[in-house]
């Protein structure tokens, strides 16, 4: 397991919202992204191929999320002072292998000026 | 240790039905995609039908679309293949196998389907 | 549908020898990074197994002596030094889309 910060703005800032990025390598095929708060599973997206290519996207925690093909955006919410903590994106990359999990994560700081709106998607 | 047991094989008439199951054991059963392969006696294998890890989506070859239904029951770890409206050259060695993410890396021993009057 | 040819159908090499066998595919496997090309041998009277993937990765526990290669629409899977235990009929197989496909098999015993 890889752990450290995310080396890229990993809380982007809606009204009343925010936008967690976690990244993953262009190269990865199969993985999960699961979000985590401390160490509580807020989120997670996983994405397999079967054995015709056919792409599967499951959640088990769902979130409001965002999949590209480098990166998984996990939405929160009607921010309040209770999220600040940090977050963590835990990568698992089944695919190419050999099987890695990487974490990497940050501090999310809520200031009173990102608190006045509520975020509408 | 991987371990993939079908059962439900055997003769058959042309017309009839057949429901194959596959008791997967030594791994997270609903982590993957299987897969049904078939082999006729003498023959290559081809591909059957696949299905993804909580049943949403499933292919199926030409050859038995409209005719077979594959399906997973994830609390009992056992994949299905129900068999309709089968045909002699359906008759074959049915193989279960794990869809190990990049290659079928686990398969089972077979069952033996004959389909004949 | 992608349609999978072997060259040869069977070949027959001596022990400590080198065997190949060809692998063509009807349209490119090529995506990104990868070839979707994946090789299984099968012994008589058991199972396929699972040997190499991404048309050159050796799967876990497969011997060195077998190796994979090639791009596109043309593979090769080469056994290096046969030996006794390798005698086995060898496939090759796409999942590039649906549905894969197999080639028909390429048989390899001891001359």
């Known amino acids: 397991e890889i752990n450290g910060s995310a080396n890229y703005e990993m809380f982007i800032f809606h009204n009343g919202g925010v936008q967690i990025l976690c990244k993953y390598p262009d190269i990865v095929q199969q993985f999960k992204m699961q979000l985590l708060k401390g160490g509580q599973i807020l989120c997670d997206l996983t994405k397999t191929k079967g054995s015709g290519n056919t792409v599967s996207i499951k959640s088990l925690k769902f979130c409001h999320s965002q999949l590209s093909n480098n990166s998984v955006s996990f939405f929160l919410y009607n921010l309040d002072h209770s999220h600040a903590n940090y977050y963590f994106c835990n990568l698992s990359i089944f695919d190419p292998p050999p099987f890695k999990v990487t974490l990497t994560g940050g501090y999310l700081h809520i200031y009173e000026s990102q608190l006045c709106c509520q975020l509408k998607f | 240790e991987v371990q993939l047991v079908e059962s439900g094989g055997g003769l058959v008439q042309p017309g009839g039905s057949l429901r194959l199951s596959c008791a997967a054991s030594?791994?997270?059963?609903?982590?993957?995609?299987m897969d049904w392969v078939r082999q006729a006696p003498g023959k290559g294998l081809v591909w059957v039908s696949n299905i993804d890890e909580d049943g949403s989506i499933t292919e199926y070859s030409p050859f038995v679309k409209g005719r077979f239904t594959i399906s997973r029951d994830n609390a009992k770890n056992t994949l299905y293949l129900q068999m309709n409206s089968l045909r002699a050259e359906d008759t074959a060695v049915y193989y279960c196998?794990?869809?190990?993410?990049?290659?079928?890396?686990?398969w089972g021993q077979g069952t033996l389907v004959t389909v004949s009057s | 549908d992608i349609v999978m040819t072997q060259s040869p159908d069977s070949l027959a090499v001596s022990l400590g020898e080198r065997a190949t066998i060809n692998c063509k595919s009807s349209q490119s496997l090529l995506s990104g990074s990868f070839n979707y090309l994946t090789w299984y041998q099968q012994k008589p009277g058991q199972p396929p197994k699972l040997l190499i993937f991404?048309?050159?990765t050796r799967h876990t526990g497969v011997p060195d002596r077998f190796s994979g290669s090639g791009s596109g629409t043309d593979f090769t899977l080469t056994i290096s030094s046969l030996q006794a235990e390798d005698v086995a009929v060898y496939y090759c197989h796409h999942h590039y889309n649906a549905p894969p496909t197999f080639g028909p098999g390429t048989k390899v015993d001891i001359k």
């Open positions: 991404y048309a050159s």
């Open positions: 196998t794990r869809w190990g993410r990049f290659g079928f890396d686990s």
């Open positions: 030594g791994f997270t059963f609903s982590d993957y995609w």
